[in-house]
């Protein structure tokens, strides 16, 4: 694969995986009420990062944000954190990339330059992606933690008032938005290895083991090795550098935005 | 405003069967759920099912499943209630009902009463 | 299923006097999504259909008179008419709107002493 097809398709990758993730920080189905072996209400509860939400079978759904910092679980606002830092993450790795483009013009910018630049966003991209998959993986282990201590207790009556009067305990199973946030991650991630890869290519080694040939008077031709000169350590092949002329211009024009995907 | 229409009396002989009809007007019928409703002379309230316009979907009490079939006619914005093997039990007045924030039962139709008699 | 229970089956209240009704369901209504419980009011006359009076156990359905007035949580539930008119004589319905399936309480027929 080229260079800029690589690299051009860990920024797509990486975008799409970053829209994703965005799209599920945005969603209110982080968990969801379980239905499996529960009475059938006439009522659906779901919950996000941000807000509460409940369906009734009328179709009138309500919301109520989260409108406490202090009384929210501590493991809420790390999941909150990490999908946070992810995406600031994500929007820095997409703005260093978009200048790391190899098919994009931007002034006098040597190879050089924009390999550090590619591999600056692969990084970036990488720890969004990594962000992401421990916040919703943070979640999701809260979920079952929380689903086998309710489990338990619907079993050991303790819901129960004398025996007489039953309340059903509502369980919350995973929602829409974790598996949303697990792709998304794993497509930044992934996205972010490609611009890694790519910076290996874009890397200016053409110097790297350079031999000085010369003709002595009718004798054979003799080689001297050169000096060595330090690389980057991601190999020593020449690339061909394509020059494009004129401005700024963009192979990948389209850019996915995020939806926010609501119950009705 | 919201209305709801429903079919004539109807007299029926056991064994038979009888089709209710729900027109309803004033709102977009595929968007809210038309719920079902059987008061036996003198009696109380029984919740029979309901249906989701939108989507046929349907939900009943199991009393009277095989009993009751509830479908619905978008193009007509009617709700239709058919009961099957008709018996002296089933003589009661049948109420439909359009469904309102926390699933009460805002809006009803006038009822129909169903007399089975031999 | 679950059972809902009102008392009394029938009241006497004399005009412009407090009127209540209880009402007690086998399984708590409240949900804990939205701290609402699913619990409605109906009023019915002889040869009409029933009205609803009271959703979400304690809101007012816009055009009832605010005589009419709902509490209570979980499992146990109050009808109030604080000023018996005599246009409120009729038989009162509460019903489940949690579970499916939808139950009513089996009336409270209020009637003026």
């Known amino acids: 694969m080229s260079v800029t097809a690589c690299q051009g398709l860990g920024f797509v990758v990486s975008l799409i995986g970053f829209a994703g993730i965005i799209a599920a920080t945005c969603m209110d189905q982080w968990s969801t009420q379980d239905l499996y072996n529960n009475p059938v209400t006439a009522v659906f509860n779901y919950q996000g990062l941000w807000r509460s939400c409940v369906r009734e079978s009328s179709g009138f759904t309500e919301c109520r944000g989260y409108f406490t910092l202090l009384g929210l679980p501590a493991m809420l606002q790390a999941v909150r954190a990490l999908m946070i830092v992810g995406i600031v993450l994500g929007v820095i790795g997409i703005l260093v990339s978009i200048f790391a483009l190899k098919c994009i013009r931007i002034g006098s910018m040597d190879d050089s330059a924009k390999a550090k630049m590619t591999l600056t966003s692969g990084i970036l991209f990488i720890i969004s992606g990594i962000c992401a998959i421990i916040g919703v993986s943070v979640f999701a282990n809260m979920l079952v933690t929380n689903f086998w201590m309710s489990t338990a207790n619907m079993y050991s009556g303790m819901g129960g008032m004398g025996g007489m009067v039953q309340t059903v305990q509502t369980r919350y199973t995973f929602g829409a938005a974790l598996f949303v946030g697990w792709v998304a991650g794993g497509l930044t991630l992934i996205g972010g290895v490609m611009m890694c890869i790519a910076c290996r290519g874009l890397t200016p080694d053409d110097s790297n083991f350079k031999a000085v040939s010369y003709h002595a008077s009718g004798q054979n031709v003799a080689y001297r090795p050169g000096g060595f000169k330090a690389s980057t350590g991601f190999g020593s092949n020449t690339r061909n550098k394509k020059i494009y002329d004129g401005g700024a211009r963009t192979e990948d024009d389209e850019q996915s935005h995020p939806t926010k995907y609501d119950y009705v | 405003q919201v209305q709801l229409v429903q079919s004539g009396a109807e007299v029926k002989k056991p064994g038979s069967s009888v089709k209710v009809s729900c027109k309803a007007s004033?709102?977009?019928?595929?968007?809210?759920?038309i719920e079902w409703v059987k008061q036996a002379p003198g009696q109380g309230l029984e919740w029979i099912g309901l249906?989701?316009?939108?989507?046929?979907?349907?939900n009943y009490n199991e009393k009277f499943k095989g009993k009751a079939t509830i479908t619905a006619d978008k193009s007509t914005s009617t709700a239709y209630m058919e009961l099957s093997s008709l018996r002296s039990e089933d003589t009661a007045v049948y109420y439909c009902?359009?469904?309102?924030?926390?699933?009460?039962?805002?809006?009803w139709g006038q009822g129909t009463l169903v007399t089975v008699s031999s | 299923d679950i059972v809902m229970t009102q008392s009394p089956d029938s009241l006497a209240v004399s005009l412009g006097e407090r009127a209540t009704i209880s009402c007690k369901s086998s399984?708590?209504?409240?949900?804990?999504?939205?701290?609402?419980?699913?619990l409605a009011w109906y009023q019915q006359k002889p040869g009409q259909p029933p009205k609803l009076l009271i959703y979400?156990?304690?809101t007012r359905e816009s055009g009832v008179p605010d005589r009419f007035s709902g509490s209570g949580s979980g499992t146990d539930f109050t009808l109030t008419i604080s000023s018996l008119q005599a246009e409120d004589v009729a038989v009162y319905y509460c019903?489940?709107?949690?579970?499916?399936?939808?139950?009513f309480g089996q009336g409270t027929k209020l009637e003026i002493k």
């Open positions: 004033g709102y977009a019928f595929s968007n809210y759920l």
């Open positions: 019903q489940n709107d949690y579970f499916y399936p939808f139950t």
């Open positions: 399984q708590s209504l409240l949900n804990s999504g939205n701290n609402k419980n699913y």
């Open positions: 009902a359009r469904v309102y924030y926390g699933n009460s039962f805002a809006y």
């Open positions: 979400w156990a304690s």
């Open positions: 249906i989701n316009p939108g989507s046929g979907g349907t």
